[in-house]
Every structure is written in C-alpha cells, then in structure tokens.
Interface confidence: low
C-alpha cells in the first residue's frame, strides 16, 4: 500500500514509535489531530506483508484513513477514533504492536460526547428541520465485529427545534427491543448500541421532524461474527456468461472475510493439452490478484473486446489465514449469429444460473 | 486523501518526445488501474489507454498504438505516460486518471491535467 | 466504435430551471456514465452507473437510460452548475467520450 505523503496536515501530528510486542502503549489525541503511529520491523528486520486492526476489525484505507506497512494515520481524528489499535502480520496475524488511542478535547470519561451537534440558535425565525453535518451521515453501510459499540448520528437543526425518534426495520425503536438496552443522546441527535450481536443487524431510521416538515435518513447495520471464517463468496448473475465475438464481458463476485483476503481471478488453461498437471491440479493462469482491505468487496472481472479463447471457465479465489474459497464462472463466445440463437433457446427455456 | 500528482506543462518541439508522470498517493497504488486521457484544446476526452499497476499489463486504444506508452514505477506509485515523435495534432492537456475500485468503466480520481504543447 | 452523441452542445438555462441534456449512442450500451468541466479543471465524476451520483453531487442531478438513449437531468438549475458535462461508455472497445454539453447560466 502507499501513504498519502504529501497529505497537509492541519493541526499537530504527533508520531509515537511502536511499543514493544505485547506491550500496550496508552496514547491521548485531542480532537482535530493527525494520529500518527508507527510500527517498524522487530529488531529492524524486513516485516512481510502487515495489517491495521481497530478493536478486531481490519481497517480500510480512505481520504481520511491512510494505511502504510510500518505507519498509520488518521486524519482530524474525532471521538469515533478511540479505540484499540494494533499492527499484525498478514499471514499469521501476530500482533506486532498495540495502542490503546483515546481522542478527547479535555480529559474526560470515554462515554462524553462532544456538544458540538446540539441544536443552536440559527437566527432563522421558522424552519422545517435540515441536516447540520451531512458529511457525518456519509457512510450509510455499517458492518461491525460482534460486542462492538455503534452508533448513528442525525445532527439536525430547524426552528423550533425538531423531535428525534428512531424506527428499527420501519417500526418504533425502544431500549426494551434489545437486551443491554440503547442511549438515545437527543442533545447529539445519536442512537448508541453497545454490545452488538447478530439480532442488531437490520435497517435503523432517525426520523427528524418539527411541524414545518420532516426528514430521516436510514443506516443499515451488519453485525459480522466474532469467529473468523474463511472467505465467503457470493457470485454475481449471471454468473454462466454467452457473448458475442468482440463484445465486452464482466464477471461480478462479492466476497466477504472479516480478515483480509487475497483476491484473485484466475482462468483455467490448457498445457500441451492437457487441462491439469502430473498431480491433478487443475493449470490455471492469474488474471488480477491483489489484497482486499475491506470486509466486503465486489469485484470484477473485466473482459474486452472477446475472442474464441477468452471462452472458457474462470474462478473468483479468495484465501485467508484461515481457508480458500471459490467460485467458478463460465464463458462461451461465438460468432453473432450462433449468440443469438443461444440467447433465444435461454430465453425460452428461462434462465438457469449458478449460485 | 487520494491524490494524482502530474509533472508540469511541456514545451517540446516536432519529432520529439516527451514523458509525464502521474504520482499516486493516498491509496494501494497497485489495487487500481491507472487510465490517461487526451483533451484537445477546446475539444472533448479521449482514451488512450490503461495499466494495471500490480503486473504492468496495458490496454490502448488503437487510435494512440505506438503513439503512447505506458509504465509505472511501483515504488514510487508514479505512472508514466511516454508520447513519441510528436507532431501539432499531439498538443493537448493529458489526464492520468485512476479507476472508481469495483467500476472499472470509468474514472473516480483525476489527476490536474499536464500541457503538452508542440511547437517550432 | 461506439459514437456518442450529444444534445444540445450548447444550452442556457435561468436558476431554478429544470435541465436535461441527452446522450445518444450508435449501438446499444450497459451503462453510462457523466463528468461534469469546469474551465481550467480536471473533469470530476459526476454519475456512474447511469443513475447513481458520485459522492458529493446535489440531489438535483439525476440520471436515467438505457440502450441507445440516456439523459441526465437538473431539476432546479444552479449558478453553479454552469459547465461542461460529458457522457462516456465502456460496454464496447474502444471507451469513448461524448462530445460534450456546454450549459451557461442565463
């Protein structure tokens, strides 16, 4: 992976070196900051392929994540950035250092919020509600390790101020609906769960309104099971493919691994005519492989402009620390005429697809 | 923040050559296609081709075969664009632009843009 | 290769006016997808997938189509969103681009 080296950084940027393995080093950001942590090599050796976890979860690189073998950063880090982070390798998953990192604008108690969502005088006589931070309502996919805490933000403002209510899958949410209960923070227009287990999963709406209007926005939760698993793929339809001669193909396959996977697409080939080697192992060839850094991927397999040998069988391979799956897809391609004959018959008999 | 980095405008004259660099920062410079873009002046985009950083495997438009060539530098997360023998019709600003992940049909991050200007 | 064509190539509109321009293909495409120019810019993606908006895009643009025929709509025209947009597709090779809308401000 490359880090974003000529990122500027507002506001200090403190880079900590890494403790020694099976230490945890307690670090304290305030709100605003670049954190900074470093991992070199032990004993200044090479490292091999590394990974970036927050409390159990691998951590995916964005504008504002940004992920290096031996160095982490977090940009404007905020309370949601607390949490325990750690440098593991790849393949075994050894952890390599360990942080505790808390991000706090005065030393206060892990569960008080900021106030800055609270509702404020707008100077606007009326008003139906509006969003005050759309920015923070980005990510409206969450998927979360089990025994995790989450929480949804809808920061909104209107005049009078609006109510905030909270539906799970379309109906009235309350702390009764879920052993451990829920905190509804109405001064930061937040839902927080702690704890998190399978049950939680679901479609959870912030309904925001005053009697000039209303708004909501929905988040999706996906709680992922603690024990890990190997990669389990879910093949894009369809996933038997016929094309025309020089057309364009694609191959769609969804992988999802809570440990980051090696992603390939491969094609099975024949050599000296023969489809597998002296130990029965199929031949294939490598089309794309690279390194997923993200609990759920959609990949594709792009194929242009065909011709008679792109036909054939093509595997979507995912490998983990802990197993390999697979999925196969099928290819045949012929010349205009015979494509559209097959199409027809396809047509007619309905579509078989495999799963 | 992903970000793509262009070398600076160009002045070069007829039958010469010239190299722009596309430097990638902010993400696995090596999980994404790299693509470049023509754009005339005053004119619309055209596709010259693409690299896969991971294994250098390239895709041109038969438009601009032995005109570009492409490379990258893993190392660095630099891609180069190599345009040969270059006449008037080659001025124009070019594009490194990097594929939006799992959309490989089109172009999430661009670069500023490099001037390539061809004159005696 | 597949030609796109782009109406009109040149437009103006007054704010709160609704917009929509069209891009036409030669041959029948997957998907499209929009970048929207502004003088002395890179191009930024606007919509992939025919209708979905890259991150950041008002709610006012939309975008819908298929086969041949494709559009992209502002329901309420903005100082703003005075620029260049143009239409590109990849379900055949070479990837080709329209020639592009020209929308000013009124």
């Known amino acids: 992976e490359s880090l974003g080296t000529e990122q500027r950084v507002v506001g200090r940027a403190a880079e900590v070196p890494g403790p020694e393995p099976g230490q945890q080093e307690q670090l304290v950001f305030g709100s605003g900051d670049a954190v900074e942590l470093s991992c070199p090599p032990p004993g200044g050796g090479p490292m091999g392929p590394t990974v970036w976890v927050k409390d159990g979860t691998g951590l995916v690189p964005s504008e504002r994540v940004l992920v290096g073998p031996q160095r982490l950063q977090v940009l404007n880090a905020s309370h949601e950035d607390s949490g325990a982070y750690s440098c593991r390798q790849r393949l075994t998953q050894r952890v390599l250092c360990h942080f505790s990192v808390r991000v706090t604008d005065a030393p206060s108690s892990g569960d008080d919020e900021d106030g800055e969502d609270e509702a404020e005088d707008t100077g606007v006589d009326t008003g139906a509600p509006y969003w005050t931070r759309p920015e923070r309502m980005d990510k409206k996919l969450l998927a979360v390790p089990a025994a995790n805490t989450v929480r949804f933000r809808c920061p909104a403002a209107g005049n009078p101020t609006p109510s905030i209510s909270w539906l799970k899958n379309g109906r009235e949410f309350r702390g009764e609906h879920r052993i451990g209960g829920i905190k509804l923070r109405h001064q930061q227009w937040s839902l927080v769960m702690e704890s998190v287990v399978p049950s939680d999963r679901g479609n959870y709406t912030c309904v925001v309104e005053n009697k000039f209007g209303s708004i909501r926005q929905t988040y999706t939760l996906d709680v992922l099971e603690r024990s890990p698993h190997r990669p389990i793929l879910q093949a894009g339809l369809p996933a038997n493919q016929t094309a025309v001669l020089g057309s364009d193909v694609e191959f769609h396959c969804k992988v999802y691994s809570d440990a980051q996977p090696h992603i390939q697409w491969l094609k099975h080939v024949e050599v000296n005519g023969s489809k597998v080697g002296p130990d029965g192992t199929p031949y294939v060839t490598v089309l794309k492989s690279w390194i997923s850094e993200s609990v759920e991927a959609d990949v594709r397999l792009r194929l242009a402009n065909v011709s008679e040998r792109d036909g054939g069988e093509y595997l979507c391979r995912a490998t983990n620390f802990i197993g390999v799956a697979e999925k196969a897809f099928w290819l045949s391609v012929h010349g205009p005429r015979a494509a559209e004959e097959e199409l027809v018959e396809a047509d007619e008999a309905g579509s078989v697809y495999a799963g | 923040e992903i970000q793509l980095q262009q070398s600076g405008p160009e002045l070069v004259k007829p039958g010469a050559s010239v190299k722009v660099s596309c430097k990638a920062s902010g993400y696995a410079f090596t999980s994404y296609n790299m693509y470049w873009v023509k754009q005339s002046h005053g004119k619309s985009l055209e596709w010259i081709g693409y690299i896969d950083p991971y294994n250098g495997g390239t895709r041109d438009n038969q438009k601009f075969k032995g005109k570009a060539t492409l490379t990258v530098d893993k190392s660095s997360s630099t891609a180069y664009m190599h345009l040969n023998s270059l006449t008037s019709e080659d001025s124009a600003v070019y594009y490194c632009a990097r594929e939006g992940g799992n959309y490989e049909a089109w172009f999430a991050y661009w670069g500023q843009g490099t001037l390539v200007t061809v004159s005696a | 290769q597949i030609v796109l064509t782009q109406s009109p190539a040149l437009m103006s509109a007054s704010p709160g006016e609704k917009v929509t321009m069209t891009c036409s293909a030669s041959?029948?495409?997957?998907?499209m997808y929009w970048y929207q120019q502004k003088p002395r810019s890179s191009p930024k993606p606007w919509i992939y997938l025919t209708s979905n908006l890259a991150s950041g895009v008002p709610a006012r643009f939309s975008g819908s189509g298929s086969g041949t025929s494709y559009s992209l709509t502002i329901s309420s025209m903005e100082a703003e969103d005075a620029a260049t947009y143009y239409c590109?597709?990849?379900?055949?090779?070479?990837?080709?681009f329209g020639a592009g809308t020209k929308l000013e401000l009124k």
């Open positions: 041959s029948s495409v997957s998907y």
């Open positions: 590109q597709q990849w379900s055949s090779n070479p990837l080709t």
